[in-house]
């Protein structure tokens, strides 16, 4: 009688997360009698996956009719595979006894799990920055396997080159994470711009995942001010306007000063939007010239998005 052999024909099996993995195992003899057990890993720390005779293993089903006479097929199917199931699985024949003793092991089948990366999450700087400044964006994606992955950055469809990417951990793992930081130089036209992080992985069948960040959440475009005097509207009254142009975001407070004294404060409300996403706003002040003996210095002072105030002044001549 030839001695029993345990045959695991597949050296490796690759399965997508969520699917079932079939691990093949046959024996060449019914003798000695004793159960087949499946383990993940080898040595004293190995994990029992299935015991033909003892215990309940809800995720495991036998592929063949295992309670059939002369059954020598002990292949199993493991349902709902996750990256944590990756490893080398051994089909082991035990000899019946008290307790059962290990008789012979198969060569092992390495199970690798193909897991999709999570949707990339792009985050920008905590504080807004102004044009000509360089800001950093980060992109993170987790839970993918195998380790090979490609990450690209785009700004408005144009690929960026100034970025650094790390995949962790460096060694073997059930799943991996990617972290990338890109540097972007802001321009005044970036209110409508988008930064895109694109992740390509074998599990995505050529359809990469994208994460986006709107530069509108990052950029601050400071306003330009222009103060002009309008023709006299009525006797003793002068209309002075303050044009606040090309600012973003909308949060803006304007204060009129007459000879350094606060005349009026208002908040930008009915703004007009430019094509590039910035805003314009205009405020005017009616000055009663007859109330002044001397020339009047009018100042338009603007506080934009919590930043230090900027101002523009206009000298109003009062004729004797």
């Amino acid at each position: 009688e030839e001695e029993l052999q345990v045959i695991q024909p597949d050296k490796s099996v690759s399965v997508a997360a969520g699917e079932s993995a079939i691990l093949h195992c046959t024996v060449t003899s019914l003798i000695p009698v004793g159960p087949i057990q499946w383990f993940r890993g080898a040595g004293p720390a190995r994990e029992l996956i299935y015991n033909q005779k003892e215990g309940h293993f809800p995720r495991v089903t036998t592929v063949s009719e295992s309670t059939k006479r002369e059954n020598m097929d002990f292949s199993i199917s493991i349902s709902n595979i996750t990256p944590a199931d990756a490893g080398t699985y051994y089909c082991v024949k035990f000899r019946k006894g008290s307790p059962d003793t290990e008789f012979k092991s198969g060569a092992g089948t390495e199970l690798s799990v193909r897991a999709k990366p999570s949707a990339p999450v792009v985050s920008g700087p905590a504080a807004r920055a102004t044009p000509q400044h360089t800001v950093s964006f980060t992109c993170e994606s987790h839970g993918f396997s195998p380790r090979d992955i490609t990450l690209k950055w785009f700004k408005n469809g144009n690929e960026l080159s100034d970025f650094q990417t790390n995949v962790d951990p460096v060694g073997e793992s059930v799943s991996y994470s990617i972290h990338s930081t890109a540097k972007v130089v802001l321009t005044r036209e970036d209110v409508h711009s988008q930064v895109i992080c694109e992740v390509a992985h074998v599990t995505l069948q050529g359809d990469p995942l994208r994460g986006t960040a709107n530069l509108s959440e990052t950029i601050r475009v400071p306003p330009t001010l222009e103060v002009t005097q309008q023709p006299v509207r009525a006797e003793n009254q002068v209309n002075v306007t303050c044009q606040v142009r090309k600012f973003y975001p909308q949060r803006l407070q304007l204060t009129w000063l007459e000879n350094g004294n606060v005349s009026r404060t208002e908040t930008a409300s009915t703004v007009t939007e430019n094509k590039d996403g910035t805003y314009n706003w205009m405020s005017w002040l009616l000055v009663n010239v007859s109330a002044h003996r001397d020339d009047v210095k009018l100042t338009c002072q603007v506080e934009h998005d919590g930043q230090p105030a900027v101002s523009k002044s206009h000298d109003l001549k009062v004729s004797a």
Partner: antibody, heavy 121, light 111 residues
Amino acid sequence: EVKLEESGGGLMQPGGSMKLSCVASGFTFSNYWMNWVRQSPEKGLEWVAEIRLKSNNYATHYAESVKGRFTISRDDSKSSVYLQMNNLRAEDTGIYYCIRDYDYDAYFDYWGQGTTLTVSS
Amino acid sequence: DIVLTQSPASLAVSLGQRATISCRASKSVSTSGYNYMYWYQQKPGQPPKLLIYLASNLESGVPARFSGSGSGTDFTLNIHPVEEEDAATYYCQHSGELPYTFGGGTKLEIK
């Protein structure tokens, strides 16, 4: 430690009914086929019935001498196997053993101590 | 049904000697190279105890002085050297097909 404990035997009149029970412990009951075998001085050891697993749809098989009169059943949640015996005859007298089939092959590796049924008027 | 005929019905063997029990089936109990024959030992007041499975394989915990052989329709149980505790009745049983049947038994006495 594997244990099989039968109960329910006793003295019955011909034509009567009786139910034998067997409680198992020390192993995963739901993974094993279970059998009843009886023994009498007249007939020696005689296989009576077999019940298979849930995955086998609890298939049952019977000796010709008891077919239609005896019913084997199991309750995996209680690790128990039963033998319902109707229309009892004198020749059903004997010790009834509850047995575990180790390898789906009438490999009777563990036997209970037995319960005695006497059918007599 | 497959009928199993055991012989002898009883035998007496001296301590340390060999006991040989035969079991003949009315039809082959062998398929695919496996011999579906089992041997049991029964002592008074106890249930039978499995000794040999698939004709020639020693059940776990059974002393090596018990051995089985045979194929097809003819099978043998050997006990050597016989010890006092081996005094019992021995049964063969087949699982070649349903229904499973047992031999009539062989009573072994130690001289």
